[in-house]
């Protein structure tokens, strides 16, 4: 239609509820339904402050659709002030909802079962391990490989060899520090790798093992005896 | 040598406060969280807070909430408990405890370091 | 918060013979990481408590093989197998797998 329209809110009932008290691990949807013509776009504050994907652990989702954000896993440090803004050039519309994290017992860190996962690939290859880790306090990750020394996985000491690929630092985010990836892969990059979430309360951890095949092309080249060649 | 020595304790009178400090030696104190522990005379050992290796989270026990704060000063190697508000049942021998570190251990993570602990009395 | 339960309250064993320390947690101490976070502890007259077993069965360094530890995710056991008479003390369970950490009310060990 030709009818232009600054943004409107479609369904006030959805959004009376201003003050949501939910319980740590939770998951929280906030709905701000609207229509306007052309159709209004919508952004999400927090705390006055764009609100970024690398501003929490796990991200968020928004669903434009629904005009809703979603945050899975809620923590304390997700308390506050959360203002959708809905616009168009012919008008912006907002609206502020206050989250309050009800918190748990702190617990040591919690990783997602069965992640990282067993992989395999060959040579040449790329693979990547993914870590979900759950922690009331904001976590430390790390992904740690077990490597060896003058053939050995164990020093003198019978602690094992290993080697910090990856770290949250200033400059990498939560949800980067949950994949590890190997590019272009080699013999010398197969065994076992950990992921490693610790918090004021302790440390977990989770291994998973990389196996290296040889490339398709190249494994006559390896394994053949010069009996079979021609 | 790995050593935490706790001092700062004493005699107080209720309502009063008291600054504990706790000085860590011989490993990477801007590494690990520490904790307090206490226990009163001829009784068992009870937690009573904990702060993250940076500083950036402090979790208490219900029994200290809003009277004590941990804190931390990684450049001098020190672990804090300011107590406010002290009353008779506070009274115990407070200890320092170093708790999880930042990275892989092969052994216990944490709560294996204690120090010798510092005596406080809270007494009118 | 997690409640820990310790029998029993006292202990007198003879010099050689074993001696067992039981523990009961209000809530599974087993991890999603597959470890099970009960510390055992012995403290002795006028000193800080001393690490014995971590993770359940783990032997803290240094600490005799004659100390074990064994259960699973809400009893726990501390066994001793032979005792002497430096094993004089309180001995203490500990849940470290939330806050607030909690202790046992402790088991005092004497020689008779």
């Known amino acids: 239609s030709n009818n232009k329209r600054a943004p409107y809110w479609t369904n006030t009932e959805k959004m009376e509820k201003r003050l949501h008290a939910v319980p740590a691990a939770n998951t929280v949807k906030f709905r701000c339904p609207a229509g306007g013509n052309p159709m209004p776009t919508m952004r999400w504050l927090k705390n006055g402050k764009e609100f970024k994907q690398e501003h929490r652990i796990g991200g968020y989702k928004v669903r434009n659709q629904h005009w809703s954000l979603i945050m899975e896993s809620v923590v304390p440090s997700d308390k506050g002030n959360y203002t959708c803004v809905v616009e168009n050039e012919y008008g912006s519309i907002n609206h502020t909802y206050h989250l309050d994290v009800v918190e748990r017992s702190p617990h040591r860190p919690i990783l997602q079962a069965g992640l990282p996962a067993n992989a395999s690939t060959v040579v040449g290859g790329d693979v990547e391990f993914v870590c979900k880790v759950y922690s009331d306090a904001q976590p430390h990750i790390q992904w740690i490989k077990h490597v060896e020394k003058n053939g050995s996985k164990y020093g003198p000491d019978g602690l094992p060899y290993l080697k910090v690929l990856k770290a949250a630092g200033v400059n990498t985010t939560d949800k980067e520090i949950e994949v590890l990836y190997i590019r272009n892969v080699t013999f010398e990059d197969a065994g076992e790798y950990t992921c490693l979430a610790g918090n004021s309360i302790g440390i977990s951890f989770h291994s998973a093992w990389l196996t290296v095949l040889p490339a398709p092309g190249r494994e006559k080249e390896i394994t053949a005896s010069p009996d079979y060649l021609e | 040598e790995v050593q935490l020595v706790e001092s700062g304790g004493g005699v107080v009178q209720p309502g009063r406060s008291l600054r504990l400090s706790c000085a860590a030696s011989?490993?990477?104190?801007?590494?690990?969280?520490m904790h307090w522990v206490r226990q009163a005379p001829g009784k068992g050992l009870e937690w009573v807070a904990v702060i993250s290796y940076d500083g950036s989270n402090k979790y208490y026990a219900d029994s200290v909430k809003g009277r004590f704060t941990i804190s931390r000063d990684n450049s001098k190697n020190t672990l804090y408990l300011q107590m406010n508000s002290l009353r008779a049942e506070d009274t115990a021998i407070y200890y320092c405890?170093?708790?999880?570190?930042?990275?892989?251990?092969?052994?216990?993570?944490?709560?294996?370091?204690w120090g010798q602990g510092t005596m406080v009395t809270v007494s009118s | 918060d997690i409640v820990m339960t310790q029998t029993p309250l006292s202990l007198s064993v003879t010099p050689g013979q074993p001696a067992s320390i039981s523990c009961t947690s209000s809530r599974s101490l087993l991890h999603s990481d597959g470890k099970t976070y009960v510390y055992w502890y012995v403290q002795k007259s006028g000193q800080p408590p001393q690490l014995l077993i971590y993770e359940l069965s783990n032997r803290f360094s240094g600490v005799p093989d004659r100390f074990s530890g064994s259960g699973s995710r809400t009893d726990f056991t501390l066994k001793i197998s032979r005792v002497e008479a430096e094993d004089v003390g309180v001995y203490y369970c500990?849940?470290?797998?939330?806050?607030?950490?909690?202790f046992g009310g402790g088991t005092k060990v004497e020689i008779k």
């Open positions: 405890v170093r708790g999880a570190g930042r990275g892989y251990t092969y052994g216990p993570d944490g709560f294996d370091i």
């Open positions: 011989g490993f990477t104190f801007s590494s690990y969280a």
């Open positions: 500990m849940q470290y797998i939330e806050a607030p950490l909690t």
